[in-house]
C-alpha cells in the first residue's frame, strides 16, 4: 500500500476542454484555416463555428500543424479524446492518426511514446465519433500539443479533450543511474527505466520523469508485469551492487516549488531468492535552490534490508518536515540488487513559495478556476472516465 501515492485508475477526469474550464486563451494553434475553425472551436463535442479546429496548412508530408492546450499547472494526463469536424453532418474532416508532444516548463518539448516506443496514435474513423486513447505511459505535463497526421494530402480537423488529474507530487524530474540488465539463467531481466522522458548520458538519466513516477507498482515477482506484451522486469528499475563500490545508489529529485517534506515512499522488490533486497537504509539531504549547497546532516533511516517476507512492498522514509526544492537520497544496498517500481512523496507547498517553472505564473491574474482548487485532486461533480476491459479506449 502506498499512502498518498496516486492511483492512475482514479486519475481520469476531464480537464476542461468540453466544459470550458480551460479558457479560450489557453488554447492555441500553429495556424487555422479560418476564424470559424480557430483554436477555440477545438473543444470535444462542441459545434461552435464550423465545428472544429482545422489547420491552414497540409499535415502531409510534414506533420507540423498543432493544437496546444495549456493546463496552467502540472497534471498527470492519462487519457485523451479526439473527434473530427461533424458540424451537423456537414463536416467530413477528421484525423486518422496523430502524435502528442508535451512540456512541463514551456521550453523543453517531449514526444509522447507508448511502452514500445511508438509515437503515432490511432485517431478517428469518422467525423463525429469520439475515440479515447489511454496513454500508457501517462504524461506529466502542463502543455500538450496534438499533431494531426495524414497519409496523403487531405483536410484534417480536430476536437479534443484531455483526462487526468492534478500532479500533486510536484515532482518535476528525478536523476538516477541508468537501470541495468539482470542475467538470470533462464532469462535476461531488463531493469531499465523505459519510459524516462529526460536525457541519458554517462550512465545517468536526468531532467525527466519515467516509470518511477507513473503510478504503476511492480509485482512480487519482478520478472512478471501488470502490463501486457512487455519484457521481464518491465515494472522495475534496478541496479547491481557490483556497479556501485560506494555501496549505494544516489538519486536526486527536483520539485516545482519549495515544499515541506513529510515522507518518501519507495515501492521495492524483495525477491531475495533472486538477489533483490529492500534497501539497508536511506539517507536524504535537502536544498532550496539549484546553486545552493546541500543543507546540514542528512536524514538517515535504517531499514535492515529484510530477508524475510519476499513480497514487494512500499517502504516509508520519514523526512522530518525538512524544507527544500531538491532532494538527494542515497539508497544503501543490503543485497546484490536494488529494484524500485515507484517513488512518491508526501509534502506540503511552503506558503508564498512561487512556482519555479515556467517563469510566468501558472495562473493568469485573478483567482484560479474553481474546478482546480489546489486542495482538490479532481474537478468537482465529475466522474472519472472508466477504464474497462476491452474498453472504448484504444
Amino acid at each position: 500500500d502506498m499512502k498518498g501515492h496516486f492511483d492512475p485508475a482514479k486519475c481520469r477526469y476531464a480537464l476542461g476542454m468540453q466544459d470550458r474550464t480551460i479558457p479560450d486563451s489557453d488554447i492555441s494553434v500553429s495556424s487555422s484555416w479560418s476564424d470559424s475553425t480557430a483554436a477555440r472551436h477545438s473543444r470535444l463535442e462542441s459545434s461552435d463555428g464550423d465545428g472544429a479546429w482545422c489547420p491552414a496548412g497540409p499535415v502531409f508530408p510534414k506533420e507540423e500543424e498543432y493544437l496546444q492546450v495549456d493546463l496552467r499547472r502540472l497534471h498527470l494526463v492519462a487519457l485523451v479524446g479526439t473527434q473530427g469536424r461533424h458540424a451537423g453532418g456537414l463536416g467530413k474532416e477528421f484525423s486518422r492518426s496523430y502524435r502528442l508532444r508535451y512540456s512541463r516548463d514551456g521550453r523543453r518539448w517531449m514526444d509522447w511514446k507508448d511502452r514500445w516506443g511508438q509515437e503515432v496514435i490511432s485517431g478517428n474513423e469518422d467525423p463525429g465519433g469520439v475515440v479515447l486513447k489511454d496513454l500508457g505511459p501517462p504524461m506529466v505535463a502542463r502543455l500538450v500539443r496534438f499533431y494531426p497526421r495524414a497519409d496523403r494530402v487531405m483536410s484534417v480537423c480536430l476536437r479534443v479533450e484531455l483526462y487526468g488529474c492534478l500532479w500533486r507530487d510536484g515532482l518535476l524530474s528525478y536523476t538516477a543511474p541508468v537501470g541495468q540488465t539482470m542475467q538470470l539463467s533462464e532469462v535476461m531481466v531488463h531493469l531499465n527505466d523505459s519510459t524516462y522522458d529526460g536525457y541519458t548520458a554517462g550512465g545517468l538519466q536526468y531532467g525527466g520523469l519515467g516509470q518511477l513516477a507513473d503510478g504503476v507498482v511492480g509485482l512480487d515477482d519482478f520478472r512478471q508485469s501488470q502490463e501486457l506484451r512487455v519484457w521481464p522486469g518491465y515494472d522495475y528499475v534496478g541496479w547491481s551492487n557490483q556497479s556501485f563500490p560506494t555501496g549505494y545508489v544516489e538519486m536526486e529529485f527536483e520539485f516545482d516549488r519549495l515544499r515541506t517534506f513529510q515522507t518518501m515512499q519507495v515501492h521495492c522488490n524483495n525477491m531475495h531468492t533472486l538477489g533483490a533486497r529492500l534497501p539497508g537504509g536511506v539517507e536524504c539531504r535537502f536544498k532550496r535552490g539549484p546553486a545552493m549547497a546541500w543543507e546540514g546532516e542528512p536524514v538517515r533511516h535504517a531499514l535492515g534490508g529484510s530477508l524475510g517476507d519476499p513480497r514487494a512492498r512500499a517502504i516509508s522514509v520519514p523526512l522530518g518536515g525538512h524544507v527544500g526544492r531538491f532532494l538527494q537520497c542515497r539508497f544503501l544496498f543490503a543485497g546484490p540488487w536494488l529494484l524500485f517500481s515507484e517513488i512518491s512523496f508526501i509534502s506540503d507547498v511552503v506558503n508564498d513559495s512561487s512556482d519555479t517553472f515556467p517563469p510566468a505564473p501558472w495562473w493568469p491574474p485573478g483567482p484560479p478556476p474553481t474546478n482546480f482548487s489546489s486542495l482538490e485532486l479532481e474537478p468537482r461533480g465529475q466522474q472519472p472516465v472508466a477504464k474497462a476491459e476491452g474498453s472504448p479506449t484504444a
Epitope: Y199, G202, Q242
Partner: antibody
C-alpha cells in the same frame, strides 16, 4: 564528440606535470571520466576516475602520486612527483552505458606521451 | 583491491578460426565487465559492455559470456583485421582495473 589530451613532454624525475584532457561537443559534467596509461610495450593501466559529482577514485598504486580534477570542458591529471616508471602514453576516456545499463569506455582520446628521464 | 587476470597472454590462430580469451576477477563482479580491442599505435576501442552487449558497429563474430568471476571473449570466423591486443575491464561507477591483455596473432 571528441577528447584530446595535451601536456605530455619530457620531464626530469620529481618535476610536477599536469596533463589536460579537453572535451569537444559535450559537457564533462554528466560523465565519469577516466585516466588510463600505457607504458611502451605494456598493457593498459587504470590510474583514476572522476565522477560527474567530482568524486575521485584512484588505483591503490596511484594514490598520492596523481590528482584528478575537472571543469565542464577539461579533466586534469596532475603527476605530483614523476619517476622513470611513469613513462607512458596517457589516455583520457569517457564512460557511457550500453543498452543493458553497464558502463564501458566508449570515447577515448588519442593519448599524450610523457617521458620521465634524467 | 580487485585484480583482473587474463589468459593466455598471447594466442595464435588461422583466418576463419576461433579464439577464446579468458578473464578472471579476484572477486565476483556480476555483469560489470567490458572488453576492448587495441591495435598498435591506436587508442583502445570498446567491443562489449555488461559482459554481452556489443558496442555500436562491432560485428557479431565477437561474443562475450560469463558472470561472477569467470568471463570469456570468443572471436569466431577470425579475420586479419582482428589481429590486436584485447583487454577486459571491471568498470563500475568507481575503480576500474584492466586485465593484463591478450595478444591475438592471425596467421
Amino acid at each position: 564528440q571528441s577528447l584530446e589530451e595535451s601536456g605530455g613532454r619530457l620531464v626530469t624525475p620529481g618535476t610536477p606535470l599536469t596533463l589536460t584532457c579537453t572535451a569537444s561537443g559535450f559537457s564533462l559534467n554528466r560523465y565519469y571520466m577516466l585516466w588510463v596509461r600505457q607504458a611502451p610495450g605494456e598493457g593498459l593501466e587504470w590510474i583514476g576516475t572522476i565522477s560527474y559529482g567530482d568524486t575521485t577514485y584512484y588505483a591503490s598504486w596511484a594514490k598520492g602520486r596523481f590528482t584528478i580534477s575537472k571543469t565542464s570542458t577539461t579533466v586534469d591529471l596532475k603527476m605530483t612527483s614523476p619517476t622513470t616508471e611513469d613513462t607512458a602514453t596517457y589516455f583520457c576516456a569517457r564512460a557511457d552505458t550500453g543498452d543493458n545499463g553497464y558502463l564501458g569506455l566508449q570515447l577515448w582520446g588519442p593519448g599524450t606521451l610523457v617521458t620521465v628521464s634524467s | 583491491e580487485l585484480v583482473m587476470t587474463q589468459t593466455p597472454a598471447s594466442v595464435e590462430a588461422a583466418v576463419g578460426g576461433t579464439v577464446t580469451i579468458k578473464c578472471q576477477a579476484s572477486q565476483s563482479i556480476g555483469s560489470v565487465l567490458a572488453w576492448y580491442q587495441q591495435k598498435p599505435g591506436q587508442r583502445p576501442k570498446l567491443l562489449i559492455s555488461g559482459v554481452f552487449d556489443l558496442a555500436s558497429g562491432v560485428p557479431s563474430r565477437f561474443k562475450g559470456s560469463g558472470s561472477g568471476t569467470e568471463f570469456t571473449l570468443t572471436i569466431s570466423d577470425l579475420e586479419c583485421a582482428d589481429a590486436a591486443t584485447y583487454y577486459c575491464q571491471y568498470i563500475p561507477y568507481g575503480s576500474s582495473p584492466f586485465g593484463g591483455g591478450t595478444e591475438v596473432v592471425v596467421k
